[in-house]
């Protein structure tokens, strides 16, 4: 992205914050650095050089130092040709355009809130759904499995579509689709449980369209630290939506006196948001923020995209690390409330539960902690990355690795603390989850750096598929299986019910450590893969003059 960003800046299409940074540097008489592109070196009035995209750039959310790519600068690069024709000083975009992009990011984030609100509204009234339809635990498991499996299968399909067709139309259709399905599911008669299962599968498909495509639009609206900030806002939606889902589920049920009404709230909001996306989200070109001066060439085949992604070591390792996070969150979310209830039984501060829901109070506390640590984690992660970027170019994967390894320690301490102090266990959960969630936005940012714009939706989709497949699709069942296996070889007592589940859950910190290792591996290849992605973008770009209208 060397000549490329100079070219786009020269053409008056750079982001406002980068334009401001360049003006400040011009006033200071800054010269292009060694990593800069030769083509941008001596152009414009008075020979004052434009700061290269590889240099430190001041953004709204702080400064970021770009990696010198070490690639030879070719004077005849199309981007350079465009730069030569451009005005000498970068022209900032109208403020309204910046506000428009901000509004677009806000609406996309709101859509993500609704995605999770819808998902967790069902979780919030799951006991009522189970009671109404006579659903057994295996049936509740089926509902969850069908949702995750359909989400997993649909994600790569939408990834493919998202890299080739109008993304905001796909997004809106996805929201309209899951809204309609969720609304309809509130009218399913008691005897048609299979229709409820089908509806969860269809909602999974609808939500997959959003989860895979929305981050790529944000990736095309912003770059660098601004992108990290906007992705952080986007991923705030997960804890916010989840928490609001539980609240909506229970409060609407109480207000209306019927749980069916809880399923009719998010669809209405979904329809409004889907419409707003159609109206207010710009139809951005892929790679718009990365290279504003050109247009990307024709798409590659899906098979070629997949091959390229599998060969991208940073992408593969960060995806495996994401799977580790998913494994831990899925297992802990399912079993920690019950584990803490059993701990209280052992400590004689609670009665053995014979009539579910067991550990309802613990579920509520754990849910509240998860929501808050989700917020805190995203803020901490984004802030730590911003600070570390001033010190190292490998900040993104390293912050994730440190977060994971730190999280593993505190997850381990949960099982130590739970034996004597429930409050101590909750403190360990709080710190452990904060560190675990600190990599949400950063992982998405890593993907944006190492994957070219025309492959990002596919990359997000494949990462989503992998993280569910290797993560939360199986982890709750695996933990339950291990716990049962341990209990079979021990005497039947409340102590062993507690210990067996604890020993099974000890798998989580090991997987999290493994995830930390994967992030460290990502750090090894991050700079070279980022440089490769930038080089590929350069090769993919056609000059605006040659674009057929």
């Amino acid at each position: 992205m060397m000549c490329l960003e100079c070219a786009s800046a020269a053409a008056g299409g750079a982001e406002e914050e980068e334009a401001d940074a360049e003006r400040r540097r011009r006033r200071r008489g800054a010269q292009p650095g060694a990593g800069g592109s030769a083509c941008c070196g001596a152009r414009g009035v008075g020979g004052a050089g434009v700061v290269s995209a590889d240099e430190e750039v001041q953004t709204l959310s702080g400064s970021v130092r770009r990696v010198p790519s070490g690639l030879p600068s070719i004077p005849s690069t199309p981007g350079c040709a465009a730069a030569a024709k451009g005005p000498s000083a970068p022209q900032p975009k109208p403020a309204s355009l910046g506000r428009g992009r901000g509004a677009a990011a806000a609406i996309l984030s709101l859509g993500n809130v609704l995605n999770y609100l819808d998902r967790y509204t069902v979780a919030g009234v799951l006991l009522d759904i189970q009671q109404h339809f006579g659903v057994k635990d295996r049936g509740a498991g089926l509902l969850q499995s069908v949702f995750i499996c359909s989400f997993m299968v649909a994600a790569p399909i939408f990834g493919y579509l998202g890299d080739r067709f109008n993304r905001k139309v796909i997004l809106s259709c996805g929201i309209f689709f899951w809204s309609a399905v969720t609304f309809s599911s509130s009218f399913i008669p008691q005897q048609y449980f299979w229709l409820l299962v089908l509806s969860r599968g269809l909602v999974g498909i609808g939500e997959a369209s959003y989860s895979t495509i929305a981050p790529t639009i944000i990736g095309d609206l912003f770059t660098k630290n601004t992108r990290t900030l906007m992705l952080s806002v986007f991923y705030f939606a997960i804890p916010l939506g989840s928490g609001l889902g539980y609240i909506t589920g229970s409060s609407v049920k109480q207000a209306a006196g019927d749980w069916h009404w809880a399923l009719r709230v998010s669809p209405v909001l979904g329809m409004i948001t889907g419409t707003l996306i159609l109206i207010l989200v710009p139809a951005t070109k892929r790679g718009h923020a990365d290279q504003l001066g050109g247009q990307l060439k024709a798409r590659t085949s899906w098979l070629r995209d997949m091959k390229a992604l599998i060969r991208n070591r940073s992408y593969v390792f960060s995806s495996l690390a994401t799977s580790a996070v998913s494994f831990a969150t899925g297992a802990l979310g399912m079993w920690i409330p019950l584990y803490l209830h059993r701990a209280q039984v052992v400590q004689k501060t609670a009665e053995t539960c014979n009539s579910p829901p067991c550990g309802a109070k613990d579920s509520l506390i754990f849910g509240a902690i998860t929501c808050f640590t989700g917020f805190l984690g995203v803020v901490t992660g984004a802030g730590a990355t911003r600070w570390c970027r001033l010190r190292t170019q490998r900040a993104d994967p390293l912050v994730c690795a440190v977060g994971m390894l730190g999280s593993a320690i505190f997850i381990c301490l949960i099982f130590v603390a739970a034996k004597t102090s429930i409050v101590g266990a909750y403190i360990c959960i709080f710190v452990g989850e904060t560190l675990l969630f600190s990599n949400w936005a950063i992982t998405a940012d890593i993907l944006m750096y190492v994957v070219i714009p025309t492959r990002r939706a596919t990359a997000v989709a494949l990462q989503s598929f992998t993280s569910h497949l290797l993560g939360d699709a199986g982890s709750p069942y695996l933990i339950g299986f291990i716990s049962d296996l341990i209990r079979q070889s021990t005497k039947d007592s409340p102590l062993w019910e507690f210990l067996s589940l604890g020993y099974a859950l000890m798998l989580c910190p090991f997987v999290v450590v493994l995830g930390g290792m994967f992030f460290l591996a990502t750090a090894l290849f991050f700079l070279s893969d980022r440089a490769k992605a930038e080089q590929q973008v350069n090769q993919l770009v056609m000059p605006p003059a040659s674009v057929k209208v």
């Epitope: 009671q131 005897q191 449980f193 299962v197």
Partner: antibody, heavy 125, light 107 residues
Framework: EVQLVETGGGLVQPGSSLKLSCSTS????????MSWVRQAPGKGLEWVGL??????????NYAESVKGRFTISRDDSKRRVYLQMYTLRDQDTATYYC????????????????WGQGVMVTVSS | DIVLTQSPATLSVTPGESVSLSCRAS??????IHWYQQKSNESPRLLIK???QSMSGIPSRFSGSGSGTDFTLRINRVESEDFSVYYC?????????FGSGTKLEIK
């Protein structure tokens, strides 16, 4: 052939306890939710409570009129369901039916597809 | 709790006539209603589930309809063995509740 046979009825004094038993055959008992339904002499049917299967953690639900006084339990190995009645009142006098709910593996119904012949419980001083 | 009101309490008909038994719920319960027949000194037996689905082995003259709050059990051309008490039961919410019953008697 599905069979439900209730035993343990009889005449008891108010305030005393009684345990009814229902032995079953002809269906997969361990997977099936079971209910007790009663009928006072010359009156209509009244649901007493139900007990779910192992896959629903043996959760029990009761009618408000018996909550805290009656307990339903089951023994899957013996294919039996029990109704333990404490602090019996005159108004508990009724024929008690053991019933099964139709099962669909992932979920169960809330209607009663098979009924026992019933057992009479008389609460009187 | 959902209250089910059956009407009439008693219905006198001659064999060969067709009759309709009504069951009204205190709130909307979709199609979560079931009909039982109880002959004198016998246990009840399930006739219709979910408002309109006939159980196997039940004569085709028995049919059910309705949704929401109003439900009907129809018996086409009543036969002598049909003279019994009929109960509706809702499964929409716990506690499960029954109607007070409709007694079908010979005119």
């Amino acid at each position: 052939e599905v069979q439900l046979v209730e035993t343990g009825g009889g005449l008891v004094q108010p305030g005393s306890s009684l345990k009814l038993s229902c032995s079953t055959s002809g269906f997969t008992f361990s997977e099936t939710w079971m209910s007790w339904v009663r009928q006072a002499p010359g009156k209509g049917l009244e649901w007493v409570g139900l007990i779910k299967d192992k896959n629903s953690n043996y959760e029990a639900n009761y009618a408000e009129s018996v909550k805290g006084r009656f307990t339903i339990s089951r023994d899957d190995s013996k294919r039996r369901v029990y109704l333990q009645m404490y602090t019996l009142r005159d108004q508990d006098t009724a024929t008690y039916y053991c019933t099964s709910h139709e099962d669909f593996y992932y979920y169960s119904s809330y209607y009663f597809d098979y009924w026992g012949q019933g057992v009479m419980v008389t609460v009187s001083s | 709790d959902i209250v089910l009101t059956q009407s009439p309490a008693t219905l006198s008909v001659t064999p060969g006539e067709s009759v309709s038994l009504s069951c009204r719920a205190s709130q909307g319960i979709s199609t979560s209603i079931h009909w039982y027949q109880q002959k004198s000194n016998e246990s009840p037996r399930l006739l219709i589930k979910y408002a309109s689905q006939s159980m196997s082995g039940i004569p085709s003259r028995f049919s059910g309809s309705g949704s929401g709050t109003d439900f009907t059990l129809r018996i086409n051309r009543v036969e002598s063995e049909d003279f019994s008490v009929y109960y509706c039961q809702q499964s929409y919410n716990l506690p499960l509740t029954f109607g007070s019953g409709t007694k079908l008697e010979i005119k």
